[in-house]
Protein backbone atom coordinates (compact mmCIF):
# COMPACT_ATOMS: atom_id res chain seq x y z
CA UNK A 1 0.00 0.00 0.00
CA UNK A 2 1.17 3.54 -0.72
CA UNK A 3 0.69 6.00 2.11
CA UNK A 4 0.82 9.78 2.07
CA UNK A 5 4.27 11.13 3.14
CA UNK A 6 2.62 13.59 5.54
CA UNK A 7 0.80 10.76 7.35
CA UNK A 8 3.98 8.71 7.63
CA UNK A 9 5.90 11.73 8.93
CA UNK A 10 3.28 12.49 11.60
CA UNK A 11 3.14 8.81 12.63
CA UNK A 12 6.93 8.72 12.93
CA UNK A 13 6.76 11.86 15.08
CA UNK A 14 4.16 10.18 17.35
CA UNK A 15 6.41 7.11 17.74
CA UNK A 16 9.28 9.34 18.84
CA UNK A 17 7.24 11.40 21.28
CA UNK A 18 5.66 8.38 22.95
CA UNK A 19 8.68 6.11 23.19
CA UNK A 20 9.81 4.59 26.49
CA UNK A 21 12.06 7.16 28.16
CA UNK A 22 12.50 9.09 31.42
CA UNK A 23 9.66 11.57 31.75
CA UNK A 24 9.05 14.36 34.23
CA UNK A 25 6.18 13.31 36.48
CA UNK A 26 4.49 14.56 39.64
CA UNK A 27 4.86 12.14 42.53
CA UNK A 28 2.38 12.31 45.40
CA UNK A 29 4.77 11.97 48.35
CA UNK A 30 2.22 10.60 50.80
CA UNK A 31 1.13 7.88 48.37
CA UNK A 32 4.69 7.08 47.34
CA UNK A 33 5.69 6.36 50.94
CA UNK A 34 2.29 5.08 52.02
CA UNK A 35 2.30 7.16 55.19
CA UNK A 36 -0.49 7.34 57.77
CA UNK A 37 -3.61 9.19 56.66
CA UNK A 38 -2.99 12.02 59.13
CA UNK A 39 0.49 12.74 57.73
CA UNK A 40 0.66 15.39 55.01
CA UNK A 41 3.48 16.96 53.04
CA UNK A 42 3.93 20.50 51.80
CA UNK A 43 4.26 20.58 48.89
CA UNK A 44 2.21 17.38 48.51
CA UNK A 45 4.02 16.47 45.28
CA UNK A 46 7.49 16.61 43.82
CA UNK A 47 8.72 16.54 40.27
CA UNK A 48 11.06 13.68 39.30
CA UNK A 49 11.85 11.61 36.22
CA UNK A 50 10.30 8.16 35.93
CA UNK A 51 10.24 5.78 32.97
CA UNK A 52 7.13 6.13 30.89
CA UNK A 53 5.80 5.93 27.39
CA UNK A 54 4.77 3.04 25.22
CA UNK A 55 6.41 -0.11 24.03
CA UNK A 56 5.78 -1.60 20.62
CA UNK A 57 4.15 -4.75 21.95
CA UNK A 58 1.66 -5.87 24.59
CA UNK A 59 4.24 -8.18 26.16
CA UNK A 60 6.73 -5.40 26.83
CA UNK A 61 6.90 -2.93 29.70
CA UNK A 62 8.82 0.36 29.98
CA UNK A 63 11.30 -0.14 32.86
CA UNK A 64 14.22 1.77 34.32
CA UNK A 65 17.70 0.48 33.60
CA UNK A 66 19.52 3.13 35.65
CA UNK A 67 18.55 5.35 38.55
CA UNK A 68 20.03 8.37 40.30
CA UNK A 69 18.74 9.84 43.57
CA UNK A 70 17.55 13.40 44.12
CA UNK A 71 17.49 14.82 47.62
CA UNK A 72 14.63 17.18 48.41
CA UNK A 73 13.54 18.85 51.64
CA UNK A 74 9.81 19.15 52.30
CA UNK A 75 7.63 19.94 55.29
CA UNK A 76 5.71 17.22 57.07
CA UNK A 77 2.50 18.08 58.90
CA UNK A 78 0.70 15.73 61.26
CA UNK A 79 -2.91 16.42 62.22
CA UNK A 80 -4.27 17.33 64.67
CA UNK A 81 -1.63 20.07 64.63
CA UNK A 82 0.19 19.82 67.93
CA UNK A 83 3.30 21.41 66.44
CA UNK A 84 4.34 23.27 63.30
CA UNK A 85 5.58 21.78 60.04
CA UNK A 86 8.71 19.63 60.45
CA UNK A 87 11.35 19.44 57.71
CA UNK A 88 11.95 15.97 56.21
CA UNK A 89 14.70 15.06 53.78
CA UNK A 90 13.70 12.70 51.02
CA UNK A 91 15.90 10.95 48.50
CA UNK A 92 13.77 10.28 45.41
CA UNK A 93 14.54 7.64 42.81
CA UNK A 94 15.04 9.47 39.52
CA UNK A 95 15.09 7.24 36.46
CA UNK A 96 17.93 8.15 34.10
CA UNK A 97 17.51 5.49 31.41
CA UNK A 98 14.76 3.11 30.37
CA UNK A 99 14.15 0.11 28.17
CA UNK A 100 11.19 -1.88 26.92
CA UNK A 101 11.53 -5.17 28.76
CA UNK A 102 9.55 -8.38 28.51
CA UNK A 103 6.85 -8.44 31.21
CA UNK A 104 7.96 -11.99 31.97
CA UNK A 105 11.53 -10.80 32.64
CA UNK A 106 10.23 -8.00 34.86
CA UNK A 107 8.10 -10.50 36.80
CA UNK A 108 11.07 -12.88 37.16
CA UNK A 109 13.30 -9.99 38.29
CA UNK A 110 10.84 -8.91 40.98
CA UNK A 111 10.35 -12.47 42.19
CA UNK A 112 14.08 -13.22 42.26
CA UNK A 113 14.54 -10.09 44.40
CA UNK A 114 11.83 -11.38 46.74
CA UNK A 115 13.36 -14.84 46.89
CA UNK A 116 16.92 -13.61 47.41
CA UNK B 1 9.97 28.60 63.18
CA UNK B 2 12.80 29.96 61.05
CA UNK B 3 13.60 27.99 57.92
CA UNK B 4 16.61 28.16 55.64
CA UNK B 5 16.00 30.40 52.56
CA UNK B 6 17.40 27.72 50.24
CA UNK B 7 14.86 25.17 51.53
CA UNK B 8 11.98 27.64 51.07
CA UNK B 9 13.19 28.49 47.55
CA UNK B 10 13.39 24.82 46.52
CA UNK B 11 9.96 24.13 48.04
CA UNK B 12 8.49 27.06 46.10
CA UNK B 13 10.08 25.67 42.93
CA UNK B 14 8.49 22.26 43.63
CA UNK B 15 5.06 23.90 44.08
CA UNK B 16 5.42 25.57 40.68
CA UNK B 17 6.63 22.47 38.86
CA UNK B 18 3.87 20.25 40.25
CA UNK B 19 0.92 22.61 39.95
CA UNK B 20 -2.27 21.62 38.15
CA UNK B 21 -1.75 22.38 34.46
CA UNK B 22 -1.93 20.79 31.02
CA UNK B 23 0.88 18.22 30.72
CA UNK B 24 2.11 16.22 27.77
CA UNK B 25 1.12 12.58 28.32
CA UNK B 26 1.13 9.34 26.35
CA UNK B 27 -2.33 7.98 25.68
CA UNK B 28 -2.79 4.31 24.85
CA UNK B 29 -5.22 4.60 21.93
CA UNK B 30 -6.77 1.14 22.35
CA UNK B 31 -7.44 1.74 26.07
CA UNK B 32 -8.69 5.29 25.50
CA UNK B 33 -11.36 4.08 23.08
CA UNK B 34 -11.94 0.66 24.62
CA UNK B 35 -11.62 -1.12 21.30
CA UNK B 36 -11.91 -4.88 20.73
CA UNK B 37 -8.92 -6.93 21.90
CA UNK B 38 -8.07 -7.93 18.33
CA UNK B 39 -7.74 -4.31 17.18
CA UNK B 40 -4.33 -2.65 17.43
CA UNK B 41 -3.00 0.75 16.52
CA UNK B 42 0.38 1.72 15.14
CA UNK B 43 1.72 3.68 16.91
CA UNK B 44 -0.10 2.24 19.97
CA UNK B 45 0.13 5.61 21.74
CA UNK B 46 -0.21 9.28 20.96
CA UNK B 47 1.04 12.36 22.72
CA UNK B 48 -1.57 14.87 23.91
CA UNK B 49 -1.99 17.37 26.72
CA UNK B 50 -4.10 16.39 29.71
CA UNK B 51 -4.59 18.12 33.06
CA UNK B 52 -2.26 16.83 35.71
CA UNK B 53 -0.28 17.80 38.76
CA UNK B 54 -1.26 18.32 42.33
CA UNK B 55 -3.76 20.43 44.16
CA UNK B 56 -3.11 21.94 47.58
CA UNK B 57 -5.79 19.93 49.33
CA UNK B 58 -7.15 16.39 49.48
CA UNK B 59 -10.64 17.63 48.59
CA UNK B 60 -9.51 19.17 45.31
CA UNK B 61 -8.96 17.57 41.94
CA UNK B 62 -7.05 18.86 38.89
CA UNK B 63 -9.67 19.17 36.14
CA UNK B 64 -9.81 20.60 32.64
CA UNK B 65 -11.70 23.85 32.15
CA UNK B 66 -11.18 24.03 28.38
CA UNK B 67 -10.47 21.47 25.70
CA UNK B 68 -9.44 21.53 22.08
CA UNK B 69 -9.44 18.53 19.75
CA UNK B 70 -6.43 17.22 17.87
CA UNK B 71 -6.87 15.13 14.77
CA UNK B 72 -4.24 12.40 14.32
CA UNK B 73 -3.92 9.74 11.65
CA UNK B 74 -2.79 6.28 12.78
CA UNK B 75 -2.79 2.78 11.34
CA UNK B 76 -5.38 0.33 12.58
CA UNK B 77 -4.62 -3.37 12.43
CA UNK B 78 -7.21 -6.08 13.01
CA UNK B 79 -6.13 -9.66 13.62
CA UNK B 80 -6.29 -12.12 12.04
CA UNK B 81 -4.74 -10.01 9.27
CA UNK B 82 -7.19 -10.17 6.37
CA UNK B 83 -5.82 -6.90 5.01
CA UNK B 84 -2.94 -4.50 5.64
CA UNK B 85 -2.93 -1.60 8.12
CA UNK B 86 -5.74 0.90 7.46
CA UNK B 87 -5.22 4.61 8.11
CA UNK B 88 -7.75 5.96 10.62
CA UNK B 89 -8.17 9.56 11.70
CA UNK B 90 -8.91 10.01 15.38
CA UNK B 91 -9.83 13.18 17.24
CA UNK B 92 -8.21 13.37 20.69
CA UNK B 93 -9.26 15.62 23.56
CA UNK B 94 -6.40 18.00 24.33
CA UNK B 95 -6.75 19.92 27.59
CA UNK B 96 -5.82 23.57 27.18
CA UNK B 97 -6.52 24.89 30.67
CA UNK B 98 -6.99 23.36 34.10
CA UNK B 99 -8.13 24.25 37.59
CA UNK B 100 -8.15 22.63 41.00
CA UNK B 101 -11.83 21.95 41.59
CA UNK B 102 -13.67 20.57 44.59
CA UNK B 103 -14.19 16.82 44.18
CA UNK B 104 -17.80 17.40 45.17
CA UNK B 105 -18.26 19.88 42.32
CA UNK B 106 -16.65 17.43 39.89
CA UNK B 107 -18.98 14.67 41.12
CA UNK B 108 -22.03 16.94 40.76
CA UNK B 109 -20.93 18.02 37.28
CA UNK B 110 -20.51 14.42 36.09
CA UNK B 111 -23.83 13.35 37.58
CA UNK B 112 -25.73 16.30 36.11
CA UNK B 113 -24.36 15.34 32.67
CA UNK B 114 -25.47 11.72 33.22
CA UNK B 115 -28.95 12.80 34.38
CA UNK B 116 -29.49 15.15 31.45
Amino acid sequence: AHYNTEILKSIDNEWRKTQCMPREVCIDVGKEFGVATNTFFKPPCVSVYRCGGCCNSEGLQCMNTSTSYLSKTLFEITVPLSQGPKPVTISFANHTSCRCMSKLDVYRQVHSIIRR
Amino acid sequence: AHYNTEILKSIDNEWRKTQCMPREVCIDVGKEFGVATNTFFKPPCVSVYRCGGCCNSEGLQCMNTSTSYLSKTLFEITVPLSQGPKPVTISFANHTSCRCMSKLDVYRQVHSIIRR
Epitope: K31, F33, G34, V35, Y69 | -
Partner: nanobody, 118 residues
Framework: EVQLVESGGGLVQPGGSLRLSCAAS????????MGWYRQAPGKQRELVAA???????LYADSVKGRFTISRDNSKNTLYLQMNSLRAEDTAVYYC????????????WGQGTQVTVSS
Protein backbone atom coordinates in the same frame (compact mmCIF):
# COMPACT_ATOMS: atom_id res chain seq x y z
CA GLU C 1 -3.39 -9.76 55.15
CA VAL C 2 0.10 -8.62 56.18
CA GLN C 3 1.41 -9.17 59.72
CA LEU C 4 4.30 -7.11 61.08
CA VAL C 5 6.41 -7.97 64.13
CA GLU C 6 8.97 -5.51 65.50
CA SER C 7 11.94 -6.41 67.68
CA GLY C 8 15.25 -4.92 68.82
CA GLY C 9 13.98 -2.28 71.24
CA GLY C 10 15.37 -1.87 74.73
CA LEU C 11 17.15 0.39 77.18
CA VAL C 12 20.28 2.13 75.95
CA GLN C 13 22.52 4.96 77.20
CA PRO C 14 22.71 8.31 75.38
CA GLY C 15 25.16 8.04 72.48
CA GLY C 16 24.46 4.30 72.16
CA SER C 17 23.03 2.32 69.25
CA LEU C 18 20.13 -0.04 68.58
CA ARG C 19 18.92 -1.87 65.51
CA LEU C 20 15.20 -2.37 65.16
CA SER C 21 13.81 -5.11 62.93
CA CYS C 22 10.36 -5.53 61.45
CA ALA C 23 9.52 -8.95 60.04
CA ALA C 24 6.65 -9.09 57.57
CA SER C 25 4.53 -12.05 56.60
CA UNK C 26 3.07 -12.26 53.14
CA UNK C 27 4.45 -12.28 49.61
CA UNK C 28 5.50 -9.40 47.34
CA UNK C 29 7.41 -7.79 50.23
CA UNK C 30 9.72 -5.95 47.83
CA UNK C 31 6.73 -4.17 46.29
CA UNK C 32 5.65 -2.47 49.52
CA UNK C 33 6.44 1.02 50.77
CA MET C 34 7.49 0.65 54.42
CA GLY C 35 8.65 2.79 57.28
CA TRP C 36 8.85 3.64 60.95
CA TYR C 37 6.79 5.97 63.12
CA ARG C 38 7.37 6.63 66.80
CA GLN C 39 5.22 7.83 69.66
CA ALA C 40 6.61 9.31 72.86
CA PRO C 41 4.41 9.40 76.00
CA GLY C 42 1.79 12.14 75.74
CA LYS C 43 2.92 13.03 72.23
CA GLN C 44 1.61 12.51 68.75
CA ARG C 45 2.83 9.68 66.58
CA GLU C 46 5.55 11.02 64.26
CA LEU C 47 7.13 9.80 61.05
CA VAL C 48 10.78 8.79 61.49
CA ALA C 49 11.91 7.13 58.26
CA ALA C 50 10.42 5.37 55.24
CA UNK C 51 11.43 3.62 52.06
CA UNK C 52 9.73 2.66 48.80
CA UNK C 53 10.04 -0.36 46.55
CA UNK C 54 11.76 1.92 44.02
CA UNK C 55 14.54 2.82 46.43
CA UNK C 56 13.42 6.27 47.56
CA UNK C 57 14.05 7.05 51.25
CA LEU C 58 12.68 9.59 53.70
CA TYR C 59 14.11 10.81 57.03
CA ALA C 60 12.73 13.26 59.58
CA ASP C 61 15.33 16.01 60.04
CA SER C 62 15.53 15.15 63.76
CA VAL C 63 17.07 11.73 62.92
CA LYS C 64 18.88 12.52 59.66
CA GLY C 65 22.50 11.35 59.76
CA ARG C 66 21.90 9.25 62.87
CA PHE C 67 19.29 6.72 61.72
CA THR C 68 19.41 4.51 58.62
CA ILE C 69 16.48 2.64 57.14
CA SER C 70 17.12 -0.48 55.07
CA ARG C 71 15.33 -3.61 53.95
CA ASP C 72 16.29 -7.19 53.17
CA ASN C 73 13.77 -8.50 50.66
CA SER C 74 15.08 -12.07 50.96
CA LYS C 75 14.23 -12.05 54.67
CA ASN C 76 11.04 -9.97 54.34
CA THR C 77 12.53 -7.65 56.95
CA LEU C 78 12.77 -3.89 57.40
CA TYR C 79 15.49 -2.40 59.65
CA LEU C 80 16.14 0.85 61.45
CA GLN C 81 19.74 1.34 62.55
CA MET C 82 19.76 3.98 65.27
CA ASN C 83 23.10 5.55 66.24
CA SER C 84 24.02 8.44 68.55
CA LEU C 85 20.76 7.97 70.43
CA ARG C 86 19.40 10.85 72.52
CA ALA C 87 16.89 11.03 75.37
CA GLU C 88 14.38 12.59 72.97
CA ASP C 89 14.45 9.40 70.85
CA THR C 90 12.68 7.57 73.69
CA ALA C 91 9.38 6.27 72.30
CA VAL C 92 7.48 3.24 71.10
CA TYR C 93 8.61 2.57 67.51
CA TYR C 94 6.02 1.24 65.07
CA CYS C 95 6.72 -0.35 61.74
CA UNK C 96 4.20 0.14 58.94
CA UNK C 97 3.75 -1.12 55.42
CA UNK C 98 1.56 0.14 52.64
CA UNK C 99 0.05 -2.13 50.02
CA UNK C 100 -0.73 -0.13 46.91
CA UNK C 101 -3.16 -2.61 45.40
CA UNK C 102 -6.68 -1.97 44.15
CA UNK C 103 -7.62 -1.36 47.78
CA UNK C 104 -4.65 0.57 49.26
CA UNK C 105 -4.13 -0.15 52.93
CA UNK C 106 -1.70 0.49 55.77
CA UNK C 107 -0.67 -2.33 58.09
CA TRP C 108 0.97 -1.67 61.46
CA GLY C 109 3.09 -3.64 63.90
CA GLN C 110 2.41 -3.73 67.65
CA GLY C 111 5.45 -1.53 68.43
CA THR C 112 8.74 -1.91 70.27
CA GLN C 113 9.84 0.30 73.20
CA VAL C 114 13.09 2.25 72.92
CA THR C 115 14.30 3.98 76.08
CA VAL C 116 17.38 6.22 76.03
CA SER C 117 18.50 7.01 79.56
CA SER C 118 21.61 7.10 81.67
Amino acid sequence: EVQLVESGGGLVQPGGSLRLSCAASGSMFSMYAMGWYRQAPGKQRELVAATTSGGSTLYADSVKGRFTISRDNSKNTLYLQMNSLRAEDTAVYYCYTYWRGSDPENYWGQGTQVTVSS
